[in-house]
């Protein structure tokens, strides 16, 4: 079930999505798309970053935060009822089936007569993810030094989303362990 965010017609909508680069400049490609996250990539891409910069965007969609620090939250300017729906934030960690994907539901309400705040953040506390690695069995020679050194912080209101997240599974598959703190 998607986390729900609300905005009013004519205002700006804010959809949170974060990760924490292991070091400044160690960015991960990110895409935002309209519609639920497909198996790979983003459908109907509205904005995309690469390892250095925002390399694709469409009008009214922009990143207001510091994406170089992992704040890839999407701002949609001057929303209309047509902007309602599911949006996909995909943190494209290199590797097979390694992406972290979040579906966020945007609900647009008709404008009230009285002015409302320009941004509403309907989310609760962040869950930082601390990643620690352990060795493989004797049959494995490749070390986890090749894993992208990324700590992700998911903004979520549902603890089970954290437990079932893609990154958690894939890091576990890789021989890494995750401590949620």
């Amino acid at each position: 079930s998607e986390v729900e965010y609300r905005a009013e017609v004519g205002q700006n909508a804010y959809l949170p999505c974060f990760y924490t680069p292991a070091a400044p400049g160690n960015l991960v490609p990110v895409c935002w798309g309209k519609g639920a996250c497909p198996a790979f990539e983003c459908g109907n891409v509205v904005l995309r970053t690469d390892e250095r910069d925002v390399n694709y965007w469409t009008s009214r969609y922009w990143l207001n935060g510091d994406f170089r620090k992992g704040d890839v939250s999407l701002t949609i300017e001057n929303v209309t009822l047509a902007d309602s729906g599911i949006y996909c934030c995909r943190i494209q960690i290199p590797g097979i089936m390694n992406d972290e994907k979040f579906n966020l539901k945007l609900v647009i309400k008709p404008a009230k007569v009285t002015p409302a705040p320009t941004r509403q953040r309907d989310f609760t506390a962040a869950f930082p993810r601390m990643l620690t690695t352990r060795g493989h069995g004797p049959a494995e020679t490749q070390t986890l030094g090749s894993l992208p050194d990324i700590n992700l912080t998911q903004i979520s209101t549902l603890a089970n989303e954290l437990r079932d997240s893609r990154l958690a599974n894939d890091l576990r598959d890789s021989g890494a362990t995750i401590r949620i703190g």
């Epitope: 160690n26 198996a39 790979f40 290199p94 089936m97 490749q142 992208p148 050194d149 576990r172």
Partner: antibody, heavy 118, light 113 residues
Framework: QVQLQQSGGGLVQPGGSLRLSCAAS????????MSWVRQAPGKGLEWVSG????????YNADSVKGRFTISRDNSKNTLFLQMNSLRAEDTAVYYC???????????WGQGTLVTVSS | EIVMTQSPDSLAVSLGERATINCKSS????????????LAWYQQKPGQPPKLLIY???TRESGVPNRFSGSGSGTDFTLTISSLQAEDVAVYYC?????????FGQGTKVEIK
């Protein structure tokens, strides 16, 4: 030593179903992501489906989406591919493959031939 | 998805001679944060499953003879067999594991001239 023993291939009519199995030994299946890769006669390799170690996340190629389901029984150390609504173009040798980390395929099963024909 | 293109499709080389296979990706598979190219090479002999030869562009899998080497970065990669042996007759595939579904090149068949 790591081994992947496959079974379940055969001849099936278009629209039919088949279930492939891949029994793993020499490692703990639940610790690794796994995939199915196929190879049509005389052709190259095509990734079909993948699953996380926990089994909580699955991915499929567009060509099999909605028809093939990858699953695993970690207690039996076995990987499965349920293939429904089979088409002639699904005819191929199917390989199960262990994914090292989230990266390359370091071990492969021996392959099992699936023939879809009337 | 990333498209992988190999050249040539087939290659005939005399025993003891050098064989070179090229692989080109439709977009870069270099992740600048760890300076790694997410590319592997596999060898497939007739009637057998593929066998991992090289990963991270140039790291040989355990047990692979050192006559096999990989090089390249970004979008252009090369597998070299420095001195072709009879047992090297096979089809060779490159594969990217950088993003999207993992994709393979169409394969290069290496034969003895």
């Amino acid at each position: 030593q790591v081994q992947l023993q496959q079974s379940g291939g055969g001849l099936v009519q278009p629209g039919g179903s088949l279930r492939l199995s891949c029994a793993a030994s020499g490692f703990t299946l639940s610790s690794y992501a796994m995939s199915w890769v196929r190879q049509a006669p005389g052709k190259g390799l095509e990734w079909v489906s993948g699953i996380s170690g926990s089994g909580g996340s699955t991915y499929n190629a567009d060509s099999v989406k909605g028809r093939f389901t990858i699953s695993r029984d970690n207690s039996k150390n076995t990987l499965f591919l349920q293939m429904n609504s089979l088409r002639a173009e699904d005819t191929a040798v199917y390989y199960c493959a262990k994914i090292f980390g989230s990266y390359y395929f370091d071990y492969w099963g021996q392959g099992t031939l699936v023939t879809v024909s009337s | 998805e990333i498209v992988m293109t190999q050249s040539p499709d087939s290659l005939a080389v005399s025993l003891g001679e050098r064989a070179t296979i090229n692989c080109k990706s439709s977009q870069s598979v270099l992740y600048s944060s760890n300076n790694k190219n997410y590319l592997a090479w596999y060898q497939q002999k007739p009637g057998q499953p593929p066998k991992l030869l090289i990963y991270w562009t140039s790291t040989r899998e355990s047990g692979v003879p050192n006559r096999f080497s990989g090089s390249g970065s970004g979008t252009d990669f090369t597998l070299t067999i420095s001195s072709l042996q009879a047992e090297d007759v096979a089809v060779y595939y490159c594969q990217q594991y950088y993003s999207g579904p993992p994709t393979f090149g169409q394969g290069t068949k290496v034969e003895i001239k």
